[in-house]
Structures are given as structure tokens and as C-alpha cells.
């Protein structure tokens, strides 16, 4: 039968009875071998029945005495089988065996759950020699037990290549419940049920769980560990914890905050990183995400011109990297820009609107209605045009660039003229007779040169011809205008 000792019981005497060989209580050990020094606790569990050897693993010596009497089987004496104690208490337990003096070099090793205990454990072996036998007591002490000390301890002794093994001593360290799973913080949808889990273990078992929400107990009736709490939904943030109770007392888990997902706060600090004639690069600082990751953002762009129709352009983009290049804008224009971002719950309000302007650009269209005619009397080519629409000038006109290409008998020569912005006509000298002159005109702003107009061709005859009609930019759909004389 297993003997059980509880911490409430009186400590057993260190050595309650005589061994064979009539070990007297006033004997002092001949040799004491500490395996590791350490505090020896007051609470000790020692053999309760040192008499009968157990029937477990025994070694039967082959050697006989002078009288040829066989020696009795060697075995560890029975000791306490089960020790129950509280965490942080001290404990001492031992194995004892009587070994005939004919054996030398007997050593006792301690094992826990099948593994030898080496190193800094508080193990001491004491030898009590007598005429025929030596009583050996191997003591093992733990100054402050922890849960990890739970287990089955045995002694082993090697004699004549035989191994003698003691009965196990079961150490059960009891304490307050220990959490193996605690509730975790979560972000949840408003008024939607969710689960929290709490698990704690002893010993001692059972462990009962109580849930606490915002310092109010959820279940007045305990649930056995593990416990899953279904929270029926929240309308505002709440703090949850669980209490684990056993016979030793209670342990309270960490409190976890459960947040309610909401629409995000509007972005802040919308700023202009860079402006060009037709694009604006903006950045923003995201607002609070409402406990739900941002999905995407929307950039809203309005013309700031009071005469505009007030329509809003919307550009959608990913939430990262809080940067967006707004394209397809007009040059030299003012815009109001706002940013809104969304999570799974919905869209934030729009950020404070900021004003931004595009820079001057090169004109986006060419001058219109280009006409070319030959003024033979002055040997010039007269060019006339209409300036591009103001909206499409993309800036303030500073002038025009005229390209005229002269082609004759396999020779081609291009010349460029710059003219001021005032007026819409120019005159260029005839460069080559009996040749074709091809004219194109582009508007120029400080932002650059715009596109050239479609080419207008005029034939310059040899000297002596009369009467010339003008050549002009064709109506849409016609290609390569040529003046027929």
C-alpha cells in the first residue's frame, strides 16, 4: 500500500527505527556525502516502515560468508509513497538500504520521471556502518517546491552490475490555479456575439472559472475549467478577466480590453508634396483606424474657382502608403482636396480641405486656323493663326514657335522662328524658290512648348509667277494640305 503524507501531518522523525545490525540512535554517521549544499527544511518525510524489504527490484548477492550462509536479498526499504504539499514549501524525503560491508563503492542516484537528477539538487547520502552491514540513507530536499517539481522520484543503487530500484515517491505540489489559457484582447463588431476562453489547472483539481466583465461577475455559478464565455455583444468597450478557483484559493487572469470596431477618424495633415501642371502629389496622416484595419482611401478634388460647376472628382487608392498622385488636372488651376479612408465598418469623414494649385504647363493644344500665303512682291510668306483657347493654354502665352521646312529637289531645310505673344501673324522670308514650304506653329508658355499645329504646305514657284491663293490648316479629316496654284 502507498503511504500518503500531507503537509498538515506532523513531520516524520528522520530515522524512525533500527536497521538490521541494531543501529543505535546515538550513532553518528561515519561519512556524509552532500551532493549539493542547501537549506534543509523543517518539513521532512522519511521512512515510515523501515522493516520489510519490498518485493520490487532486488539484488541477490552471489557471495557467501565464511559460514557459507547466503546473504539476504538487497532492497530499499519502504518509505512514504505520496507527498502532497503547497507551492513554495520545503520538502525532504529519503531512501534507505542496508548493504553488507563486503560491498565497496556503493553509490545511490536519484531519478525523477525516468531521468537522472544531476547537478545542483539538494541530495545527501549518509553512511551508518556497523559490524556486518552499513545503513545508507539518501536524502533529497527541495527548499521551495514549484509545480515543475511534481513527479515520481526513485533511488537507484548499482551492486555487482545489478541495479536496485526503490519504490517511487510521488511528489504532488499543490497551489493556486495556474492559467494555461487566458482571454485575449479583441476588436469586435458592435452588438455581435463573440467568445472568450479561459483555462487553468491545479493541482488541486477541480478548477472552477468565474468570468468578470467591467468588474461585474458574469456567471454566479462556476464553470469547470476550461470555460468558454459567449459574450452576447457589446455596444461599448469592456474589460474582461476570469477568476480561477480551487481549494487553495483563487488566481485572477490579466484583464483584457475588448474594443468595438467603429468607422475611422478622418485623416489629418493632408499636405502637398509636389505640384506639376497636371498633377499634385499629396500625403496624409491617417486618423485612428477605429480598431479595424484601413482598406482604402478616397481623394476628393474640387475646383476652387468660384465659377466652376462644383463637381467633385474622386480618386480611390489603397490605404498605404498614405500618398497619392492626383492626375488629369488642369494647369495653373486651384483645387480643394480632401481625403477620406475606410475600414470594414465604413468611411471616415473627410479630412479638413486644403487648397492646392497646379503649375504652368506647356499648352495642351496648338494654335488654330493656321493660314499661309505667298506675298511675292516682298518675297515673303505670310502666316496667320488663332491663338488656342485660354483653358488649354495651360499658362500665360509668351509667344509662338514657327517651324518652316523647305523642300526642293531632294534638299530639305528646317528653320525655327520665335515670335512674341502679341498678335497672331508672322512673316518669314522665302528661303528657296521652286520649293514646298511646310509650316507648323506651336504656342509657348513659361511651362514649355505646346504641340505643333498640323502642317500647312505652300508651293513657292520660280520668279515671275502671278496670283497666289492662301493655304490653310485643313478642316478636320483632311490630310496634308497642299496649295494648288
Amino acid at each position: 500500500a502507498i503511504t500518503e503524507a500531507r503537509e498538515e501531518a506532523k513531520p516524520y522523525p528522520l530515522f524512525p527505527g533500527p536497521f538490521p545490525g541494531s543501529l543505535q540512535t546515538d550513532h553518528t554517521p561515519l561519512l556524509s556525502l552532500p551532493h549539493a549544499s542547501g537549506y534543509q527544511p523543517a518539513l521532512m518525510f522519511s521512512p515510515t516502515q523501515p522493516g520489510r524489504p519490498h518485493t520490487g527490484n532486488v539484488a541477490i548477492p552471489q557471495v557467501t560468508s565464511v559460514e557459507s550462509k547466503p546473504l539476504p536479498p538487497l532492497a530499499f526499504k519502504h518509505t512514504v509513497g505520496h507527498i502532497i504539499l503547497s507551492e513554495h514549501k520545503g520538502v525532504k524525503f529519503n531512501c534507505s538500504i542496508s548493504v553488507p560491508n563486503i560491498y565497496q563503492d556503493t553509490t545511490i542516484s536519484w531519478w525523477k520521471d525516468g531521468k537522472e537528477l544531476l547537478g545542483a539538487h539538494h541530495a545527501i547520502t549518509q553512511f551508518y556502518p556497523d559490524d556486518e552491514v552499513t545503513a545508507i540513507i539518501a536524502s533529497f530536499s527541495i527548499t521551495s517546491v514549484q509545480r515543475s517539481d511534481n513527479g515520481s522520484y526513485i533511488c537507484k543503487m548499482k551492486i555487482n552490475n545489478e541495479e536496485i530500484v526503490s519504490d517511487p515517491i510521488y511528489i504532488e505540489v499543490q497551489g493556486l490555479p495556474h492559467f494555461t489559457k487566458q482571454p485575449e484582447s479583441m476588436n469586435v463588431t458592435r452588438n455581435t456575439a463573440f467568445n472568450l476562453t479561459c483555462q487553468a489547472v491545479g493541482p488541486p483539481e477541480p478548477v472552477n472559472i468565474f468570468w468578470v466583465q467591467n468588474s461585474s461577475r458574469v456567471n454566479e455559478q462556476p464553470e469547470k475549467s476550461p470555460s468558454v464565455l459567449t459574450v452576447p455583444g457589446l455596444t461599448e468597450m469592456a474589460v474582461f478577466s476570469c477568476e480561477a478557483h480551487n481549494d487553495k484559493g483563487l488566481t485572477v487572469s490579466k484583464g483584457v480590453q475588448i474594443n468595438i470596431k467603429a468607422i475611422p477618424s478622418p485623416p489629418t495633415e493632408v499636405s502637398i508634396r509636389n505640384s506639376t501642371a497636371h498633377s499634385i502629389l499629396i500625403s496624409w496622416v491617417p486618423g485612428f483606424d477605429g480598431y479595424s484595419p484601413f482598406r482604402n482611401c478616397s481623394i476628393q478634388v474640387k475646383e476652387a474657382d468660384p465659377l466652376s460647376n462644383g463637381s467633385v472628382m474622386i480618386f480611390n487608392t489603397s490605404a498605404l502608403p498614405h500618398l497619392y498622385q492626383i492626375k488629369q488636372l488642369q494647369a495653373l488651376a486651384n483645387y480643394s482636396i480632401g481625403v477620406s479612408c475606410m475600414n470594414e465598418i465604413g468611411w471616415s469623414a473627410v479630412s479638413p480641405w486644403i487648397l492646392a494649385s497646379t503649375t504652368e504647363g506647356a499648352p495642351s493644344v496648338a494654335p488654330l486656323n493656321v493660314t499661309v500665303f505667298l506675298n511675292e512682291s516682298s518675297d515673303n510668306v505670310d502666316i496667320r493663326w488663332m491663338k488656342p483657347p485660354t483653358k488649354q493654354q495651360d499658362g500665360e502665352l509668351v509667344g509662338y514657335r514657327i517651324s518652316h521646312v523647305w523642300q526642293s529637289a531632294g534638299i530639305s531645310k528646317e528653320l525655327l522662328e520665335e515670335v512674341g505673344q502679341n498678335g497672331s501673324r508672322a512673316r518669314i522670308s522665302v528661303q528657296v524658290h521652286n520649293a514646298t514650304c511646310t509650316v507648323r506653329i506651336a504656342a509657348v508658355t513659361r511651362g514649355g512648348v505646346g504641340p505643333f499645329s498640323d502642317p500647312v504646305k505652300i508651293f513657292i514657284p520660280a520668279h515671275g509667277w502671278v496670283d497666289y491663293a492662301p493655304s490653310s490648316t485643313p478642316a478636320p479629316g483632311n490630310a496634308d494640305p497642299v496649295l494648288i496654284i
Epitope: N191, N208, N219, E220, Q221, T235
Partner: antibody, heavy 118, light 106 residues
Framework: QVQLVQSGSELKKPGASVKVSCKAS????????LSWVRQAPGQGLEWMGW????????TYTDDFKGRFVFSLDTSVSTAYLQISSLKAEDTAVYYC???????????WGQGTLVTVSS | EIVLTQSPATLSLSPGERATLSCRAS?????MHWYQQKPGQAPRLLIY???NLASGIPARFSGSGSGTDFTLTISRLEPEDFAVYYC?????????FGGGTKLEIK
């Protein structure tokens, strides 16, 4: 299905005692608390307290401490309400109700009318 | 203890109409539960934890609110809905009931 069946009506004289029973079926009796609720004639509902069916420990609200005793016989899944030294103002319908998380009374007995009259 | 005040004390409506019953707590509560009681019968759980429909309760019943103000709404009254309705708070012991709202046929 979950059922709470209460004992029948009682007519008692002032100073006497009465014991009302509430037998539960259709669920594990010791997994849920058992509450008692009083409703005086023409009045609203008053929570009297509850008994922990796991530990047997009763809890009484302030107005029901003293003459009121909650008890259990878990072997027959039955809860009891005993009222001693009955007074005329104890005349009411007494309900037992299963008591679950968040203080929800999800199943109710049919009620027991206790009349105290000389 | 938390006092629950239900209003109105009596509400007279016709079948098919919408009913809105109010329950106000003297201080913040965690959840509100609602019960229906018909004459000679035990109360029956309708809504638990403010907005959750109890088993077997028709979807025309709904609950809302938070903090101290809670509402039970019956979207379209049926003849069997005329009864007394009680709110009950969770969040502070002792749990308390409101005085009830009697919903009667106009």
C-alpha cells in the same frame, strides 16, 4: 426540453411556515443557478436571490434575509423555498427561474401562489 | 441598488401599429433583459443582453440601447402581444426589475 415545475398553491395562517418546491428537468441541474422571484398581487417582479446549485450556497437580497431559506436536493434536481413566520404581506406568487450568465432568467416555473390569511 | 423606470406605465395601441417601450436606469448598467407576462402566466424571456432575441421569439421584437437608456420595440403589433413587459438589468447586484409597461388594445 427545459422545464421547471412548482408545487401547488398554499393557504397559510399568519405565523405558519410554507415550503415551495421547484423541480427541474431537461438540463444538468448543477450547471445553472436557480433564482426565486416574488410577485405580489397586481405588482411587479422582485428578485429574492438565488442558490448556487453546484455548491448549494444561497444568496439573498436585503429584503429577503431572515425568514426566507433557499435549499436544494440535487439528487432529485429540486430547489426549495421555505418561508417561516408568515405575514399577510407575504401573499404573492413565487416563481423559480433558471439563472444563467449575465443574470438572465431564461426559463421560469409556472409559479406558486402562497396566500397568508387568518 | 439600481432603479429601473419604465415608461409609459400603460400604452394603448391597435394591432398593426408600432410599439416603443422605454426603460431608464438610475445608473449605467451592462445589459438590459426584457420579459413578457400575460395574465395568470409566468414571465417569458423576450430579449437578453439588450438586443438578442431569445429562442422562439418572433423577429418583430427588438431591443436596443446602452448606458442608462434602453428600448424594446415591437415593429407591428399582433393581438397576442398585448401583455405586461418588464425590463431587468445586469451589471450591478442586486438585479432589479422595472415596474412594467402594460400594453393594451386601443
Amino acid at each position: 426540453q427545459v422545464q421547471l415545475v412548482q408545487s401547488g398553491s398554499e393557504l397559510k395562517k399568519p405565523g405558519a411556515s410554507v415550503k415551495v418546491s421547484c423541480k427541474a428537468s431537461g438540463y444538468i441541474f448543477t450547471s445553472y443557478g436557480l433564482s426565486w422571484v416574488r410577485q405580489a398581487p397586481g405588482q411587479g417582479l422582485e428578485w429574492m436571490g438565488w442558490v448556487n446549485t453546484y455548491s448549494g450556497v444561497p444568496t439573498y437580497t436585503d429584503d429577503f434575509k431572515g425568514r426566507f431559506v433557499f435549499s436544494l436536493d440535487t439528487s432529485v434536481s429540486t430547489a426549495y423555498l421555505q418561508i417561516s413566520s408568515l405575514k399577510a404581506e407575504d401573499t404573492a406568487v413565487y416563481y423559480c427561474a433558471r439563472y444563467t450568465n449575465y443574470g438572465v432568467f431564461d426559463y421560469w416555473g409556472q409559479g406558486t401562489l402562497v396566500t397568508v390569511s387568518s | 441598488e439600481i432603479v429601473l423606470t419604465q415608461s409609459p406605465a400603460t400604452l394603448s395601441l391597435s394591432p398593426g401599429e408600432r410599439a416603443t417601450l422605454s426603460c431608464r436606469a438610475s445608473s449605467t448598467v451592462g445589459y438590459m433583459h426584457w420579459y413578457q407576462q400575460k395574465p395568470g402566466q409566468a414571465p417569458r424571456l423576450l430579449i437578453y443582453a439588450t438586443s438578442n432575441l431569445a429562442s422562439g421569439i418572433p423577429a418583430r421584437f427588438s431591443g436596443s440601447g446602452s448606458g442608462t437608456d434602453f428600448t424594446l420595440t415591437i415593429s407591428r403589433l399582433e393581438p397576442e402581444d398585448f401583455a405586461v413587459y418588464y425590463c431587468q438589468q445586469w451589471g450591478s447586484l442586486p438585479f432589479t426589475f422595472g415596474g412594467g409597461t402594460k400594453l393594451e388594445i386601443k
